[in-house]
């Protein structure tokens, strides 16, 4: 960076090099150039010469003042106009940053996705800090009192093999950056209570032309969990509101769910499951579209495939433009 340049003097910042966004700051430049009594001292921000709020303090030093500085990062350097020198002489440079201290991490959630071999912990980091912010996830066994710490920049995957202290743990998150540190509340977990079954997937749909046409949705999961509760939600793509059906499911075979739908309408379906009685749900599955026929039977297999973690984002980009914000891929 700019801090690695050879300096003929120095540059410093008041109150500090990294500071809270919106503060008033002063940048000082002091020349120490052999055989040069600077005629003028210049400041540059991101390569652009500053023309205002510069004060000459003495023969070798000048100060640049910014009110309400709002840029997350800036490269500053200063130069001197020396007599008998054709070009400005570089004095020194410094990278400065502004941002915010971290918020208290909240909504700490830890889940084990079946077959993943990991416990995944996430949290709401709060407002954007603009500066490098690190998180330390503390995992303390309630049985052995042993505590492990994991450093990360966002979420964390902890191998379940490393959780040797029994089944019960306390988890909390510390957030820290150059402007401050905050700590979340402690979350108590039991490893058996946080398992999320293997993803449920809708594979196909068919409409049977009976007296009252009915649509059958075929869906499945590779889970080995015996007691699983699921929800399937569906709606016409032109609607805002979802209809939800609940199922107690045994995945020893492919599930078939029946719906009585309006003819000649495009519907969208999603499914999610949880271990019965437990806290966390799967994210909603990929969007599955099925258009009911006017009268003739029809079989479709048109799933809008994408990473289920991102179902919230994908929904927002679907061309119908009518899907509601209720479509977040959350696990709560």
């Amino acid at each position: 960076g700019i801090t690695n340049i050879n300096c003929s003097g120095h540059i410093w910042v008041e109150p500090a090099t990294i500071f809270k966004m919106g503060m008033n700051i002063s940048i000082y430049c002091q020349a120490a150039i052999k055989n040069c009594q600077p005629r003028k001292l210049h400041f540059y921000k991101n390569g652009i010469k500053e023309r205002f709020q510069i004060t000459r303090i003495n023969k070798t030093t000048a100060r640049l003042w910014y009110k309400n500085f709002l840029e997350p990062h800036a490269s500053m350097y200063c130069t001197a106009e020396c007599p008998k020198h054709f070009q400005e002489t570089l004095i020194c440079g410094k990278d400065i940053s502004s941002g915010y201290p971290p918020d208290i991490p909240d909504e700490v959630t830890c889940v084990i996705y079946e077959y993943s071999g990991n416990m995944t912990c996430t949290w709401n980091a709060g407002k954007l800090t603009y500066i490098d912010t690190k998180y330390v996830v503390h995992v303390k066994s309630l049985e052995t009192e042993e505590e492990q710490q994991y450093l990360t920049s966002s979420y964390i995957n902890i191998s379940t093999d490393s959780l040797q202290g029994g089944k019960k743990y306390l988890v909390w998150v510390q957030a820290a950056n150059a402007l401050g540190m905050e700590e979340s509340k402690q979350l108590q977990i039991h490893l058996d209570d946080i398992v999320i079954p293997s993803a449920a997937v809708i594979s196909r749909a068919e409409t049977i032309n009976a007296t009252v046409p009915k649509t059958i949705i075929y869906w499945d999961s590779q889970t080995t969990i015996e007691k699983v509760s699921c929800e399937m939600r569906y709606k016409a793509t032109t609607n805002q509101t979802w209809n939800v059906k609940e199922f107690d499911t045994n995945f020893t075979y492919v599930q078939q769910s029946e719906f009585y739908l309006e003819p000649n309408i495009k519907y969208v379906f999603q499914v999610r499951c949880q271990e019965t009685g437990k806290r966390y749900w799967q994210p909603w599955s990929s969007l599955f579209f099925h258009k009911t026929p006017e009268t003739v039977p029809q079989v479709t297999s048109k799933a809008f495939q994408h990473d289920t973690w991102n179902s919230g984002l994908t929904v927002a980009s679907i061309s119908t433009g009518h899907l509601t914000s209720d479509n977040r891929g959350d696990i709560g």
């Epitope: 801090t3 120095h10 410093w12 008041e14 109150p15 500090a16 990294i18 500071f19 150059a178 402007l179």
Partner: antibody, heavy 117, light 107 residues
């Protein structure tokens, strides 16, 4: 030559306030930041806060926020540090220091504040 | 707050010895590190700024190095007047913080 001359030692009762002054001479007072740093007996150095006299706005360490007020009077080239709700742990030598380089290159001689009932 | 940790907290050395004091920041502070010398009953004195720049009037036996999180103050040949306590300090973020100090004593 820049000099920072501080006010004399003080003995204060718990719960009271103290105001320490720091008079600058021999340099441009208003343009450089003045900080206050304290040192409890046998302990290390602790930054309390600082001010650039020409701007008048001070920055404080969170630990002292609400209890310390740093001000400056350009007309007399004097900076002040007032600490309120004194307790015995505030017994320390209080230094003013000027930052006319990347480090604190000029220091006052220190003012001993003793908090005792 | 950025924590500054010095080691050792004290050391015994003889005149002429080479002395090294280290300072570690709890997070990267680029080269924003200053070193001070303090003698009993006196105010601190700036020795090194920007991790490695020697303050005017300070003997050349003092030198500083490092950047990021790890820094070193070296006295190449200890003199009788160098027995004192040494502090590192970061001006990178508020609150400006000091190390706990390293006392250099006569062996």
């Amino acid at each position: 030559q820049v000099q920072l001359v501080q006010s004399g030692a003080e003995v204060k009762k718990p719960g009271s306030s103290v105001k320490v002054s720091c008079k600058a001479s021999g340099g441009t007072f208003s343009s450089y930041a003045i900080s206050w740093v304290r040192q409890a007996p046998g302990q290390g150095l602790e930054w309390m806060g600082g001010i650039i006299p020409i701007f008048g706005t001070a920055n404080y360490a969170q630990k002292f926020q609400g209890r310390v007020t740093i001000t400056a009077d350009e007309s007399t080239s004097t900076a002040y540090m007032e600490l309120s709700s004194l307790r015995s742990e505030d017994t320390a030598v209080y230094y003013c220091a000027r930052r006319s380089s990347p480090g604190f290159d000029y220091w006052g001689q220190g003012t001993l504040v003793t908090v005792s009932s | 707050d950025i924590q500054m940790t010095q080691s050792p907290s004290s050391l015994s050395a003889s005149v002429g010895d080479r002395v090294t004091i280290t300072c570690r920041a709890s997070q990267s502070i680029d080269n924003d590190l200053n070193w001070y010398q303090q003698k009993p009953g006196k105010a601190p004195k700036l020795l090194i700024y920007n991790a490695s720049s020697l303050q005017s009037g300070v003997p050349s036996r003092f030198s500083g190095s490092g950047s990021g999180t790890d820094f070193t103050l070296t006295i190449s040949s200890l003199q009788p007047e160098d027995f004192a306590t040494y502090y590192c300090q970061q001006p990178y973020s508020i609150p400006l913080t000091f190390g706990q100090g390293t006392k250099v004593e006569i062996k």
